[in-house]
């Protein structure tokens, strides 16, 4: 057995889940209900996080670890440890101050969170558009016409989407 904390220090030997009670000769006392200490040698226990409202409990609080929250359906976590819940939008939308708005032409969002991003510019890589972009999907780039050998069958272009994407030339 190798010591990790000093025996002569009345508080450092208190294990996780307890606190060093200065009012009672610095004995190690268990954390009161709805509080925790995740490390040894603590002088106080921290109050457990409560997952209320739009937050829901993912992991209950214990004497040695805090509760963990996530978000109710229709919302998603933001920030370290899910410090905020943000409203979901549909794919092809982004959240603005006025609520969920469709992605502008030339942008897409394939998730229920985050912002609309521009379609990939295939020509920057010397490629052509194989599949047009939509509000929900990025364009798919294919080989440039020069990559196709003579006599090779060319790709039949897809039917235009509701808002067909194009690669600026």
């Amino acid at each position: 057995f190798e010591r990790t904390r000093s025996l002569q220090d009345p508080c450092s030997n208190c294990p996780a889940g307890t606190f060093c009670d200065n009012n009672r000769n610095q004995i190690c006392s268990p954390c009161p209900p709805n509080s925790f200490s995740s490390a040894g040698g603590q002088r106080t226990c921290d109050i457990c996080r409560q997952c209320k409202g739009v937050f829901r409990t993912r992991k209950e609080c214990s004497s040695t670890s805090n509760a963990e929250c996530d978000c109710t359906p229709g919302f998603h976590c933001l920030g370290a440890g899910c410090s905020m819940c943000e409203q979901d939008c549909k794919q092809g939308q982004e959240l603005t101050k006025k609520g969920c708005k469709d992605c502008c032409f030339g942008t897409f969002n394939d998730q229920k969170r985050g912002i609309c991003r521009p379609w990939t510019n295939c020509s920057l890589d010397g490629k052509s558009v194989l599949v047009n972009g939509t509000k929900e999907r990025d364009v798919v780039c294919g080989p440039s016409p020069a990559d196709l050998s003579p006599g090779a069958s060319s790709v039949t272009p897809p039917a235009p989407a509701r808002e067909p994407g194009h690669s600026p030339q």
């Epitope: 057995f1 010591r3 000093s6 220090d9 208190c14 889940g17 000769n25 004995i27």
Partner: antibody, heavy 109, light 113 residues
Framework: VKESEGGLFKPTDTLTLACTVS????????ITWVRQAPGNGLEWIGV???????VYASWAKSRSTITRNTNLNTVTLKMTSLTAADTATYFC??????WGPGTLVTVSS | AAVLTQTPSPVSVTVGGTVTINCQAS????????LAWFQQKPGQPPKQLIY???TLASGVSSRFKGSGSGTQFTLTISGVQCDDAATYYC?????????????FGGGTEVVVK
Amino acid sequence: VKESEGGLFKPTDTLTLACTVSGFSLSYNAITWVRQAPGNGLEWIGVINYDGTTVYASWAKSRSTITRNTNLNTVTLKMTSLTAADTATYFCARNFNIWGPGTLVTVSS
Amino acid sequence: AAVLTQTPSPVSVTVGGTVTINCQASQSVDNNNYLAWFQQKPGQPPKQLIYSASTLASGVSSRFKGSGSGTQFTLTISGVQCDDAATYYCLGEFSASSGDWNAFGGGTEVVVK
């Protein structure tokens, strides 16, 4: 923190001392045993940690055992093969900051 | 096993004076500061004064001061009072590999005149 009564023992006897604690739980607090021969200094015997692990002084390891009963709030020191050199006041302490009054153990034929 | 040597013993001091007690370890204490000081009066259990070399234990007068690290440690009592007459012990904590986890010094008797 209080030690049980010591008393007179014969050489080769086995010593059993109990340390009873109140106001705190042994599940979270370490109890250490220390002894002091008459007119001499303090000598560390061993400790039982809050998790039940034990550590002993090298001289005590072969003939000492420290156990605990967390329900009864007692820690027991058992020392075998007593000799006159084991005559001492035996103390138990929570870590080293709360001490019992001590109990005198005399080993004599 | 580690050995703690205390000097001087005994030591005499007048009321209001200052006394210094030294404790030297044969090897470094754990964390370089796992050393405590205790006061013991006849017929009583020891009382912890200092832990972690320099931290004053709860309820102990600030006249007691601990210092040092590694193998050399000092307890200084300033403004000595009659009630300070006692034997003082240092206690070192060592790594388990040293053979003994805890070891006391031999004690220093302080006589107050």
